[in-house]
């Protein structure tokens, strides 16, 4: 904290301009009026104040707005945003997407800081849901944003917002998250024709149930192995050899390279060796001929 001293003669700031960068911290404290600063916040970012000087300016704004800054000030914080704590940000009411964009721009290209995470949380909670424009903005700045949300938070994403999601936005999502996102994607893309639908839904298929995979196998989609390997094991296990062959099309040959990895390994163990042999890939580990397969889970369900 800068101690209170009188402003030297002739140094009282009449406007926020570059001459202030040559002021010592105590001079800024003594010579810059908080109300003037608030009305000319848009100039601050164009002036190369040191972070120590920005601390002084922040202190002035804190005194002027102890309950939290108004959005007119927040929108123009620029690099001063980097000096805010999550506690400061929790006092704000940010409703404009333009304000959000302006603040995200300051941290562009860097990891999501606690300040940014708090800002996004405040903004999304204020809106009530993660609408398409917000999601568009957030994933543009932070491609991994969607996968940082819990399944509960993802449940508030309306299906219409799914159109904003790019494949790379889902790279770090785990199965629990995809379980929530897949039904939304299915709903969002339901009116598209077969090949276009598959292109859009492909990134979300890690959340698809068996019946949807069976339906896709009837549509000549030629799923690539990378997508197949991300499918839920429990959704892949009931698929027949014929269904997997149709699902993968020419990519079926890739199963050989993945035969030791899930879900391929577990799927092989569930297939008859005879059926696997029809693929001509040399896949081993299926159920030998003449063995009877009892589905105990089915038996339990019946009793």
């Amino acid at each position: 904290e800068v101690e209170k001293t009188a402003c030297p003669s002739g140094k009282k700031a009449r406007e926020i301009d570059e001459s202030l960068i040559f002021y010592k911290k105590w001079e800024l404290e003594a010579c810059v009026d908080a109300a003037l600063l608030a009305t000319q916040m848009d100039r601050v970012n164009a002036i190369p104040f040191t972070y120590e000087q920005l601390d002084v300016l922040k202190h002035k704004l804190d005194e002027l707005y102890p309950q939290g800054y108004p959005e007119s000030v927040i929108q123009h914080l620029g690099y001063l945003f980097l000096k805010m704590s999550p506690e400061d940000i929790r006092k704000w009411n940010v409703t404009s997407l333009e304000t959000l964009k302006a603040l995200l721009e300051v941290n562009k290209g860097h990891e999501m800081s606690p300040q940014v995470a708090t800002l996004i949380d405040r903004f999304v909670k204020g809106r009530g849901q993660l609408d398409k424009d917000t999601l568009d903005t957030l994933t543009a700045f932070y491609p991994g944003y969607l996968c940082s949300l819990s399944p509960e938070e993802l449940s508030s994403v309306p299906p219409s917002s799914i159109w904003a999601v790019r494949p790379q936005d889902l790279d770090t999502c785990d199965p629990r998250q995809l379980d929530v996102l897949y039904p939304k994607a299915r709903l969002a893309f339901q009116n598209m024709n077969g090949s276009e639908y598959f292109v859009k839904i492909q990134s979300f298929l890690g959340g698809a149930p068996t019946e949807d995979l069976k339906a896709l196998s009837q549509q000549n989609v030629s799923m690539d192995l990378a997508t197949f390997m991300k499918l839920r094991t429990d959704a892949v296990l009931p698929l027949t050899v014929a269904e997997v062959q149709k699902l993968l099309g020419p990519h079926v040959e890739g199963l050989k390279a993945e035969e030791r990895h899930r879900p391929v390994r577990d799927w092989i163990l569930r297939q008859r060796q005879d059926d696997l042999d029809t693929l001509g890939l040399g896949l081993q580990g299926g159920i030998p001929n003449g063995y009877l397969v009892l589905d105990l889970s089915m038996q339990e369900a019946l009793s």
Epitope: P48, T50, Y51, L82, N107, G109, H110, S113
Partner: nanobody, 116 residues
């Protein structure tokens, strides 16, 4: 992290010239502004010049005599000092601050002595 190393200081006659260099290494992509400060014996450290994007700023005491510049390809900051005066004698420090971490970094300083 950003590391800064100054060079180019020395003893020069009044009216002479010197060029200081500051080599930056580390996370130089995140640098926001770069500055030259100076500190004469027994005084506070004073801001001399700043480069911020394509804009430059100078303290009144050096305006018209000193020129700050930056070569991004070499990650080097310069201070060209002409018409040097005895009162320019000081330790000159290079400073940079970064986006993201909102941190200040300093070099170790280089001594400039102007003899009259």
């Amino acid at each position: 992290q950003v590391q800064l190393v100054e060079s180019g200081g020395g003893v020069v006659q009044a009216g002479g010239s010197l060029r200081l260099s500051c080599a930056a290494s580390g996370s130089t992509f995140s640098i926001r502004a770069m500055r030259w400060y100076r500190q004469a014996p027994g005084t506070e450290r004073d801001l001399v010049a700043v480069i911020y994007g394509s804009s430059t700023y100078y303290a009144d005491a050096v305006k018209g005599r000193f020129t700050i510049s930056r070569d991004n390809s070499k990650n080097t900051l310069y201070l060209q000092m002409n018409s040097l005066r005895a009162e320019d004698t000081a330790v000159y420090y290079c400073n940079a601050d970064t986006i993201g971490t909102a941190r200040d970094y300093w070099g170790q300083g280089t001594l400039v002595t102007v003899s009259s």
